[in-house]
């Protein structure tokens, strides 16, 4: 069989190398950059995706801060250290021995320091606010239809249980999607809200991580919903620790 006939690819992560060398000749896929085996029946962790992305870096993401405790991903891309489960390690360092602490979505939550910097635990991002602006349409979308479609999207495309979609707000043309998932709520096997938000962000930017699944086809009552900008705010279970100098 040719590779195309065997179709040994990872549907949920195009940034992988796959070969039929798993048990019984089954297709096994490893993330680029790390070589970690990934489960292609669900989303790959953002840490492994960022590590893979460093092999072909693109424009860094720049987000804005909605309030005093919300974090923004304004450091852009970096080559992260991931633990054996694919999660971000609490402490990240660059090649010049500059270190900092990150949250569960890999966003810096402390000032930068040196190798003596301690990050005692990986602090969970438990609340994500996705702020979207959609392109002009003939009229406003029906709020309940929009709510249902976005919940469906997160369940069907990103495999995120609807209970983690806390709310969908709409004031044309702005849509806000609130994702909430405390440490106590997330069971083994549940998709992480951070991973779902990252896949969604890449989808709306036209950089889908899915292999051959096509781009995001978002419709509300048959009317295409096209996103023209996205801002994502992250709130952690423990507020970040930045010096006053950074806040002024």
């Amino acid at each position: 069989h040719t590779a195309a006939q065997d179709n040994c690819t990872c549907p949920t992560n195009k940034m992988t190398v796959c070969s039929p060398d798993g048990p019984g000749g089954r297709c096994q896929c490893r993330a680029l950059g790390s070589g970690v085996a990934v489960d292609c029946s669900t989303l790959t962790s953002e840490c492994l995706l960022l590590k893979a992305r460093m092999s072909a870096p693109k424009n860094a993401r720049t987000l804005v801060r909605p309030n005093e405790h919300a974090l923004v991903d304004n450091d852009g891309l970096y080559d992260p250290d991931c633990d054996p489960e694919g999660r971000f390690k609490a402490r990240q360092c660059n090649q010049t021995s500059v270190c900092w602490c990150v949250n569960s979505v890999g966003v810096r939550r402390t000032d930068k320091g040196d190798l003596s910097l301690r990050c005692d635990e990986l602090v969970r991002t438990h609340h994500i606010l996705i702020d979207l602006r959609h392109r002009p349409t003939a009229g406003a979308f029906n709020h309940s239809d929009l709510d249902a479609e976005l919940r469906r999207l997160f369940r069907e495309r990103y495999r995120l249980h609807p209970k983690f979609v806390a709310a969908v707000h709409y004031e044309q043309p702005t849509i806000q999607i609130e994702l909430r998932q405390n440490t106590s709520q997330k069971a083994a096997g549940d998709v992480d809200i951070g991973d779902a938000a990252y896949y969604f962000e890449r989808d709306v930017k036209g950089e889908s991580l899915f292999q051959g699944r096509g781009g995001l086809d978002l419709r509300v009552r048959g009317e295409p919903l096209q996103v023209e900008r996205t801002l994502i705010y992250y709130l952690d279970e423990i507020p970040p620790k930045f010096s006053m100098k950074r806040l002024t």
């Epitope: 069971a187 096997g189 699944r213 086809d217």
Partner: antibody, heavy 116, light 108 residues
């Protein structure tokens, strides 16, 4: 490789309760997937009955909702179907399946006949 | 609920020929949520295509899917003897999940 296996009585009396179990092997039921039941009357098409998530959340076909209960047993890595007040119209091959961007894994199916 | 209508009901073709199967939806379905299955007598259905166009693992590249909105197509570029079976489309974008009534591809 995920495998699903249905089990349960092949014959149920009218007005009785149909009970089936689906054992999942080669993967955990506590995953991001939903787990479905689908049936197919002899010589006819496929009908989705309903599905369950590992936390017990369910979604049912409205046409069957009043008679159907789907439950999950994470400790045994299995989920179950109960259909009460059955009639001859419930005679079908019953399949369990994993719902993951379509039903990507299926059991082999079990024929349940409703007859006195 | 979303009703899926498949046509033709039966397709009589010879091995080596091209098969084109259609599925029409009563409401617009995002292409992200449409699947195709193959079922042979006495067997469970087998997922061929998800997301309207993404081939499932192990599915030969002679199978392809396309379409959007209310009209979707499954194409088998060159029929092999093992391809003669019943094919179902299914939408999983809204509850209840629904299937088309099926298209039987038989040997001419």
């Amino acid at each position: 490789q995920v495998q699903l296996q249905e089990s349960g009585p092949g014959l149920v009396k009218p007005s009785g309760t149909l009970s089936l179990t689906c054992a999942v092997s080669g993967g955990s039921i506590s995953s991001s997937n939903w787990w479905s039941w689908v049936r197919q009357p002899p010589g006819k098409g496929l009908e989705w009955i309903g599905e369950i998530y590992h936390d017990g959340s369910t979604d049912y076909n409205p046409s069957l909702k009043s008679r159907v209960i789907i439950s999950v047993d994470k400790s045994k890595n299995q989920f179950s179907l109960k259909v009460r007040s059955v009639t001859a119209a419930d005679t079908a091959v019953y399949y369990c399946a994993r719902d993951n961007w379509g039903f990507d894994y299926w059991g082999q199916g079990t024929l349940v006949t409703v007859s006195s | 609920e979303i009703v899926l209508t498949q046509f033709p009901g039966t397709l009589s073709l010879s091995p080596g020929e091209r098969a084109t199967l259609s599925c029409r939806s009563s409401q617009s379905v995002s292409s992200s949520y449409l699947a195709w299955y193959q079922q042979k007598p006495g067997q469970a259905p087998r997922l061929l295509i998800s997301g309207a166009s993404s081939r499932a693992t192990g599915i030969p590249d002679r199978f392809s899917g396309s379409g959007s909105g209310t009209d979707f197509t499954l194409t088998i570029s060159r029929l092999e003897p093992e391809d003669f079976a019943v094919y179902y489309c299914q939408q999983y974008g809204s509850s209840p999940r629904t299937f088309g009534q099926g298209t039987k591809v038989e040997i001419k």
